[in-house]
């Protein structure tokens, strides 16, 4: 089937749109396939054999990551990037998506946030002076970018289903995640759903269905009673810290 | 392995309703979107909509509004096109897809 | 009046190489929305050929290939087979009509 392929495909950039967002209960029993409308890419770093994952903006990596070049002066060559750990509280950032979950940048620095202050991606308001010569900026991956938030923010912000490019697009809950036609806003994940767990171990292949990442608080781990299954097929789901 | 089976071939008169109905297996029906496109005789392929078929939400393509339903029946795996007033260039076959898969289609004929 | 413009018809001799291309616009391909091609042959559904701008799926050959650059795509077809014969519709989103397009198609007819 098509789906079957993409676990050898060596096309990590550019697959269709998302996963269909009719988002799963919690706890309910979903295939891992990846065709199944409650996947999304949560790419996490594994210590174990651990290798660059490459990606093409910040949704492409796990919630725990951003997209970026591995340094500033990497940029010009071939404009590589790959996906990176978050910045913790109080380190330096240009955007939201480089600050770890509970966090936004807020003058170039990685601020605590009560609740979700800005969804990822949105590039902070205070600091896009300093934009101009940002590798992501210019990455020429074919995704338009956003250099202003004022551009965006009397716009409606796409429901469940609604397409978008990157998760700054989708309201309060959703992230954007493919679904093969396009990518569309579903449901981030909550405790006890299924979620995509990648171990990076050569090739790569973006699932035509994503999953949205985990909610916040939660990780993706592998569940308890799996662990005695074989390791290609151990299920993870979105579990608290 | 993932099928979508579609009704048979209709004969509808200009003015009529018509209903036709796919039916999802091999797979999580639920987990999907599932999207109806219609191809007139020697013509191209033309987008209708799409239905959520867990929460049954829709999105239909401007030139149908008014004039299509997309309904969906969890409990049996299937979703649903009704389409309304119809008139002879709504002749057509009609495919359900799942983006990924496609049913073979049903062929409509509106002929008074 | 399809969003996405391809030419009518295309052709080549056996072994030879054919290109189709799809021209759209800054609300379609050039806003990144991905395009993806399916070949139709007469009287069957669409089968997917490219996904994603330039992936293959399983089964299809490498024969076929899909590339996009700005508010346009193509498809190459090197080594043409008399099997190849058929329709040929690229597809994608776009934003100003906020729903899926396909292209006007492209029938590849082998020579010989």
């Known amino acids: 089937t098509l789906n079957s392929v993409l676990i050898n495909s060596n096309a990590i950039k550019n697959l269709p749109p998302p996963l269909g967002g009719a988002g799963g209960q919690p706890g309910s029993a979903v295939s891992v396939a990846p065709g199944v409308l409650y996947e999304g890419g949560n790419k996490y770093q594994t210590l174990d054999n651990y290798q660059p994952y490459p990606c093409a903006e910040d949704e492409e990596c796990g919630s725990d990551e951003y997209c970026s070049s591995p340094s500033r002066g990497a940029a010009g060559v071939g404009g590589v990037q790959i996906c990176l750990a978050c910045r913790k509280r109080r380190k330096r950032c240009m955007r939201h998506a480089m600050c770890c979950p509970g966090n936004y940048c807020k003058n170039g620095i990685c601020m605590p946030s009560d609740h979700s202050h800005f969804p990822r991606g949105e590039i902070e308001e205070s600091i896009i002076e300093n934009l101009g010569n940002d590798h992501n900026a210019a990455a020429g991956d074919g995704y338009p970018r956003r250099t202003t938030l004022t551009s965006k923010i009397y716009h409606t912000k796409g429901q469940e289903g609604s397409v978008c490019l990157r998760s700054s697009d989708c309201a309060a809950g959703l992230c954007c995640a493919r679904h093969f036609w396009s990518k569309i806003c579903k449901p981030v994940l909550k405790e006890g759903q299924v979620c995509t767990k990648h171990k990076r171990k050569g090739s790569h292949g973006l699932e035509i269905f994503q999953r949205c990442y985990c909610g916040e608080g939660l990780a993706c781990r592998i569940q308890k009673d799996h662990h005695q299954a074989s390791n290609s097929s151990r299920l993870h789901t979105c579990q608290r810290h | 392995q993932v099928q979508l089976l579609q009704s048979a071939a209709e004969v509808k008169k200009p003015g009529e309703s018509l209903k036709i109905s796919c039916k999802g297996s091999g797979y999580d029906f639920p987990g999907y979107y599932l999207h109806w496109v219609r191809q007139a005789p020697g013509q191209g392929l033309e987008w209708m909509g799409w239905?959520?078929?867990?929460?049954?939400?829709?999105n239909y393509a401007q030139n149908f509004q008014g004039r299509v339903t997309m309904t969906r029946d969890t409990s049996i795996s299937a979703a649903y096109m009704e389409l309304s007033s119809l008139r002879s260039d709504d002749t057509a076959v009609y495919y359900c897809?799942?983006?990924?898969?496609w049913g073979r289609g049903t062929t409509v004929t509106v002929s008074s | 009046q399809s969003v996405l413009t391809q030419p009518p018809s295309a052709s080549g001799a056996p072994g030879q190489r054919v290109t189709i291309s799809c021209t759209g616009s800054s609300s379609n391909i050039g806003a990144g929305y991905d395009v993806h091609w399916y070949q139709q042959l007469p009287g069957a559904a669409p089968k997917l050929l490219i996904y994603g701008n330039s992936n293959r799926p399983s089964g299809v050959p490498d024969r076929f290939s899909g590339s996009k650059s700005g508010t346009s795509a193509s498809l190459a077809i090197t080594g043409l087979q008399a099997e190849d014969e058929a329709d040929y519709y690229c597809?994608?989103?776009?934003?100003?009509?906020?729903?899926?397009?396909f292209g006007t198609g492209t029938k590849v007819t082998v020579l010989g």
């Open positions: 897809t799942r983006e990924d898969h």
């Open positions: 239905i959520n078929a867990n929460s049954g939400a829709t």
């Open positions: 597809q994608s989103y776009d934003s100003s009509l906020s729903g899926y397009v």
